[in-house]
Interface confidence: low
C-alpha cells in the first residue's frame, strides 16, 4: 500500500530542516543527501555523516533527498515533435521544448506536443505565438476561424457555426447590390 | 482498481472497416488523454493514435493517418478507434490505455482486442 502523502515530511518535521529522522532509530536526525546525489546508507549516528553518493548516468535528484535511488532522466518524445533544450545531469532532469515558431499543446498534465505556430494567413495576428499557446488570429472580412485558420466564407456551410459569422457579409453585398440598382 | 476493456476486434477483409470500443472504469476517465497502440505479430509494440481528455486534439500515427479516426465519449468513459480501409499490415492486437506521459508512454492497459485483415 501506498503510504498517506505526507508520512514522511510529519516523520521529517520532527528534525531541523536538512535533516530526516533515522528509520531504525527516531532519536537521531541525519542531514539530507544534497541534489546530485542519493542515499545510500542513513548516518550511523548523531553528528556523523549521512553516506551519499553521486547518481549514476542517466540518472538525477533535483533536491536535498533521503531517496534510496536516483530518479530515472526523462527522455524528450521525438514522436511528439520535442526536442531537447539541455541535458540531463545529476541534479536536473533533461529539459524538453519546441524548434522556433512552435508552441506547445499539453495532453496531460507533463506530457506536451509541438505544433507549428498559425501564420494567420487571411486575417491579422490578434495574440502572438506563446510557448503554451498558438497564435489567436483574427480574420479578415470574408473569411472565417475554423481550427485557428482563416476559412473563406464560400467554404461555410449553413449547418455550420460559421454562419453567423459569414451571414453579415453576404447581406452586406447584397445590400450594396441592391442600392446600386435603385 | 483500473479497468480497459475492449472489444470490436475480428476477421475483416482488405479495405473492410471496424471499430473498436474501449470501456474504462476505475479512475476518472475525463482527466487523462487515451490512446491505441498495436502489437502485431512477432513485432514490437506500435503506437497508434492520441487524444487529449477534452477530445478536442488528436494524434496519428503516419501509417494510419486519414483512414483511422479516434474519439472518445467522456460521458460513457468510452474510447472508440475507427478503422477504415483496412490493410493486411494492420492486423495486430490493438490495446487501449491511458497516456499520462510522465515515466513510460501509457502506464495502464487493457488486455487487447485482435484484429485480422485477410482476405
Known amino acids: 500500500l501506498v503510504p498517506h502523502l505526507g508520512d514522511r515530511e510529519k516523520r521529517d518535521s520532527v528534525c531541523p530542516q536538512g535533516k530526516y529522522i533515522h528509520p531504525q532509530n527516531n532519536s537521531i536526525c541525519c542531514t539530507k543527501c544534497h541534489k546530485g546525489t542519493y542515499l545510500y546508507n542513513d548516518c550511523p549516528g548523531p553528528g556523523q555523516d549521512t553516506d551519499c553518493r553521486e547518481c549514476e548516468s542517466g540518472s538525477f535528484t533535483a533536491s536535498e533527498n533521503h531517496l534510496r535511488h536516483c530518479l530515472s532522466c526523462s527522455k524528450c518524445r521525438k514522436e511528439m515533435g520535442q526536442v531537447e533544450i539541455s541535458s540531463c545531469t545529476v541534479d536536473r532532469d533533461t529539459v524538453c521544448g519546441c524548434r522556433k515558431n512552435q508552441y506547445r499543446h499539453y495532453w496531460s498534465e507533463n506530457l506536451f506536443q509541438c505544433f507549428n505556430c498559425s501564420l494567420c494567413l487571411n486575417g491579422t495576428v490578434h495574440l502572438s505565438c506563446q510557448e503554451k499557446q498558438n497564435t489567436v488570429c483574427t480574420c479578415h472580412a470574408g473569411f472565417f476561424l475554423r481550427e485557428n485558420e482563416c476559412v473563406s466564407c464560400s467554404n461555410c456551410k449553413k449547418s455550420l457555426e460559421c454562419t453567423k459569422l459569414c451571414l453579415p457579409q453576404i447581406e452586406n453585398v447584397k445590400g450594396t447590390e441592391d442600392s446600386g440598382t435603385t | 482498481e483500473v479497468q480497459l476493456l475492449e472489444s470490436g476486434g475480428g476477421l475483416v477483409q482488405p479495405g473492410g472497416s471496424l471499430r473498436l470500443s474501449c470501456a474504462a472504469s476505475?479512475?476518472?476517465?475525463?482527466?487523462?488523454?487515451m490512446g491505441w497502440v498495436r502489437q502485431a505479430p512477432g513485432k514490437g509494440l506500435e503506437w497508434v493514435s492520441q487524444?487529449?481528455?477534452?477530445?478536442?486534439?488528436?494524434y496519428y500515427a503516419d501509417s494510419v493517418k486519414g483512414r483511422f479516426t479516434i474519439s472518445r465519449d467522456n460521458s460513457k468513459n468510452t474510447l472508440y478507434l475507427q478503422m477504415n480501409s483496412l490493410r493486411a499490415e494492420d492486423t495486430a492486437v490493438y490495446y487501449c490505455?491511458?497516456?499520462?506521459?510522465?515515466?513510460?508512454?501509457?502506464?495502464?492497459w487493457g488486455q487487447g482486442t485482435l484484429v485480422t485483415v485477410s482476405s
Open positions: 476505475g479512475f476518472t476517465f475525463l482527466k487523462f488523454s
Open positions: 490505455a491511458i497516456y499520462t506521459g510522465r515515466w513510460a508512454p501509457f502506464e495502464y
Open positions: 487524444i487529449a481528455n477534452t477530445g478536442d486534439r488528436r
